[in-house]
Interface confidence: low
């Protein structure tokens, strides 16, 4: 580490005095200090002498000696005060520029350490500092305003009490710059626009930034529009607004509009599309199949997408039958707006009952007219089965009726013993009826089929079972000849 002579941290001299500062190191050494007049520099190998024979208040400052070849970068310093009764301050810079929230050092150096007790910082013309200005003082360096704010961009003076009066430094201008995080923030409203030819329209392009230096423009397709700009300062941000007013739109006004803003950090742009149409429109669609099948007891949401301009004047869900004359409860209908011209309407049908199968229609109206979209809802049911013994054309016949949706398949089983349900070990014979007779098949109703099993003689220690199944479940009926009746099972889901 270099060594300075005289070996004191501070040196106090009077104006006109001779000052010699000598620095010695292992290798070559260099001096660094405030820019001031009358210094003479003499270097000789590993030593360097800084001297003046006419010190002035401007020589006040910290002088540092470094050894450039030292890998540890060691240095030594001495602070020189040249105490001039007429000049308590040596101002090293008259303009200081920092970013917001940085510490701002105002470099007014005290020329006499004795004056430290009576120093203060003021704004020019003796005005007090702004409230909440947090600052500290060092006689070697000056005043530091901590975490400077944009609003603290002012002209300051350092004040010292000398013999009961305040002596001011020359002024120091502090410029606190906003930290510009990036290009200006943008809004372009509306995000989408539709108008009928001849209607009025308004598009507003707006940009804001913490710094006033930015540009904003609105362009249609690739043409920059000449629009007067409104400026404002609000919430500590500068705002520039371009408003395009079109009294009577025509097809040439349609297309892509881009709002573009730029500053030193870069450019931002956002776009919207303006559609001009000949007349009002209203389009209904659904991502769902319009023919729906749901198991009874389950729920279903019917969704309709609406694209419309102008806005809807009315809409509702209607049940068109064929069962009850009930109408969907309004609380089960829900509307959400995805954007200005697109809406989704949902009808929630929880725990569907048999009487709720049928056609549901969504109707909407705007100045373009009425439109409707109709869903057909069929309920699925597990099969219900019954078996009777009868004679057909003189032959004993077991007649099985199965009702459900989708159309049930029928299988006959003959098994040994009396049982409510044939299991594999008991089965003697199995007959599949691939084409049972369809007794009824109306839209939105269950399908009823009938299957006949001709039995010449009923074996009394056996069971005849009719089983029906579809995609929802299965049902069966066991017929036991010896008994007065037969055993049935409810449908298995």
């Amino acid at each position: 580490i270099p060594v300075i002579e005289p070996s004191v941290p501070e040196l106090v001299v009077k104006p006109g005095a001779t000052v010699t500062l000598r620095c010695v190191g292992n290798g070559s050494v260099e001096w660094d200090g405030p820019p001031s007049p009358h210094w003479t520099l003499y270097s000789d190998g590993s030593s360097s002498i800084l001297s003046t024979n006419n010190a002035t208040f401007q020589n006040t400052g910290t002088y540092r000696c470094t050894e450039p070849g030292d890998p540890l970068g060691g240095s030594a310093a001495i602070h020189l005060y040249v105490k001039d009764p007429a000049r308590p301050w040596n101002v090293l810079a008259q303009e200081v520029v920092v970013f917001e929230d940085q510490d701002a050092l105002l470099p007014c150096l005290l020329t006499d350490p004795v004056l430290e007790a009576g120093v203060s910082l003021v704004r020019v013309r003796g005005r007090p500092l702004m409230r909440h200005t947090n600052y500290s003082f060092s006689p070697w360096h000056g005043f530091t305003i901590h975490r400077a704010k944009f609003i603290q961009s002012q002209d300051y003076q350092c004040s010292a009490l000398m013999g009961g009066r305040k002596v001011m430094s020359i002024s120091i201008r502090l410029k606190v710059q906003k930290v510009i995080p990036g290009p200006p923030a943008l809004t372009l409203v509306p995000a989408e626009l539709v108008r009928i030819r001849g209607e009025a329209a308004q598009i507003v392009c707006s940009a804001s930034s913490v710094d006033v230096n930015f540009d904003v423009f609105l362009q249609h397709n690739n043409t920059k529009l000449a629009i007067p700009q409104q400026s404002d300062f609000h919430n500590n941000r500068y705002q520039k607004v371009l408003t395009l007013n079109l009294d009577q739109v025509d097809f040439q006004h349609a297309g892509n509009y881009s709002c573009v803003a730029s500053n030193v950090q870069g450019k931002h742009s956002t776009s919207m599309f303006f559609r001009v149409v000949e007349s009002a429109y209203l389009n209904l669609s659904s991502e769902q199949n319009l023919i729906q099948e749901v198991t009874v007891g389950e729920g279903l949401n019917l969704k309709v997408m609406v694209e419309a301009y102008p806005g809807l004047q009315g809409f509702n869900w209607t049940y068109l039958g064929p069962f009850s004359d009930h109408q969907p409860e309004p609380k089960l209908a829900n509307a959400t707006t995805k954007d200005t011209y697109r809406h989704t309407f949902t009808l929630s049908l929880p725990r569907l009952k048999p009487s709720e199968a049928g056609r549901y229609s969504f109707l909407a109206r705007n100045p373009g007219g009425w439109r409707a979209l109709t869903f057909e809802l069929t309920l699925r049911y597990p099969p219900e089965v019954s078996v009777i013994w009868t004679f057909i054309n003189g032959s004993g016949t077991l007649l099985c009726a199965a009702s459900g949706y989708p159309q049930p398949n029928v299988t006959w089983l003959q098994c040994s013993g009396h049982t409510d349900r044939c299991d594999e070990a008991q089965v003697l014979q199995v007959w599949d009826d691939p084409y049972p007779e369809v007794l009824s098949q109306e839209p939105f109703h269950k399908v009823t089929v009938q299957s006949l099993l001709t039995v010449e003689t009923l074996e009394h220690n056996q069971t005849y079972e009719c089983r029906a199944h579809n995609s929802v479940g299965s049902g069966s009926w066991a017929f036991i000849p010896i008994s007065a009746g037969a055993h049935t099972h409810p449908p298995d889901e």
Epitope: T187, Q202, V204
Partner: antibody, heavy 126, light 107 residues
């Protein structure tokens, strides 16, 4: 300075039509995003929103009163007028008009009542 | 219509107390909520907009929070001039609806 003032009859008879005028200054109802609304408050009760009119002549009404209310504006006179038909004693209230602050960029629209009139008390009685 | 349920309907508090008023929306209103203060015989005054933004000139002891369906107005240290009735207002959907009000009285 933004100011609004309501004027109209202090007493109306049942079944009559009430006409209230809101005269304002310090802003223009032609400014993009600007609106004026009406709110009422029966004695000792909560506030109830009645209607809004916007710079582009868009109008919105409280559905519970919609077939009785009409809102209109005269931008040249800086006035908004509310008419309410078929008045009933339950309509006795203080009626306020209020400005709906304009759109401030780049923030979203200020859709709230930021300046209010002093209110006018309307009594419905035969 | 969206119902705004304010609670409590009234409360007694002392100067310096921390006071919390809640407003519950019957469905999601995002942050489209304002708080107003009304003194007897006076028009309401806007305190908070967009659920948490403080209106210019309103003391910082007032703050708002919440989004969706649950909202809170907090007065961090009640002052004598804060004794009044407070209302919430939703403007997410028409019709705009106010809460029933909360009367803050001196204990």
């Amino acid at each position: 300075e933004v100011t609004l003032k309501e004027s109209g009859p202090a007493l109306v008879k049942p079944t009559q039509t009430l006409t209230l005028t809101c005269t304002f200054s310090g802003f223009s109802l032609t400014t993009y995003g600007m609106g004026v609304g009406w709110i009422r408050q029966p004695p000792g009760k909560a506030l109830e929103w009645l209607a809004n009119i916007w710079w582009d002549d868009d109008k919105y009404y409280n559905p519970s009163l919609k077939n009785r209310l009409t809102i209109s504006k005269d931008t040249s006179k800086n006035q908004v007028v509310l008419t309410m038909t078929n008045m009933d004693p339950v309509d006795t209230a203080t009626y306020y008009c209020a400005r709906i602050g304009p759109i401030k960029y780049p923030t979203a629209p200020y859709r709230y009542f930021d300046f209010w009139g002093q209110g006018t008390m309307v009594t419905v009685s035969s | 219509d969206i119902q705004m349920t304010q609670s409590p309907s009234s409360l007694s508090a002392s100067v310096g107390d921390r006071v919390t008023i809640t407003c519950l929306a019957s469905e999601d209103i995002y942050d489209n909520l304002a708080w107003y203060q009304q003194k007897p015989g006076k028009a309401p005054k806007l305190l908070i907009y967009y659920a948490s933004s403080l209106q210019d000139g309103v003391p910082s002891r007032f703050s708002g929070s919440g989004s969706g369906t649950d909202f809170t107005l907090t007065i961090s240290s009640l002052q004598p001039e804060d004794f009044a009735t407070y209302y919430c207002l939703q403007d997410s959907e028409y019709p705009w609806t106010f809460g029933g009000g909360t009367k803050v009285e001196i204990k």
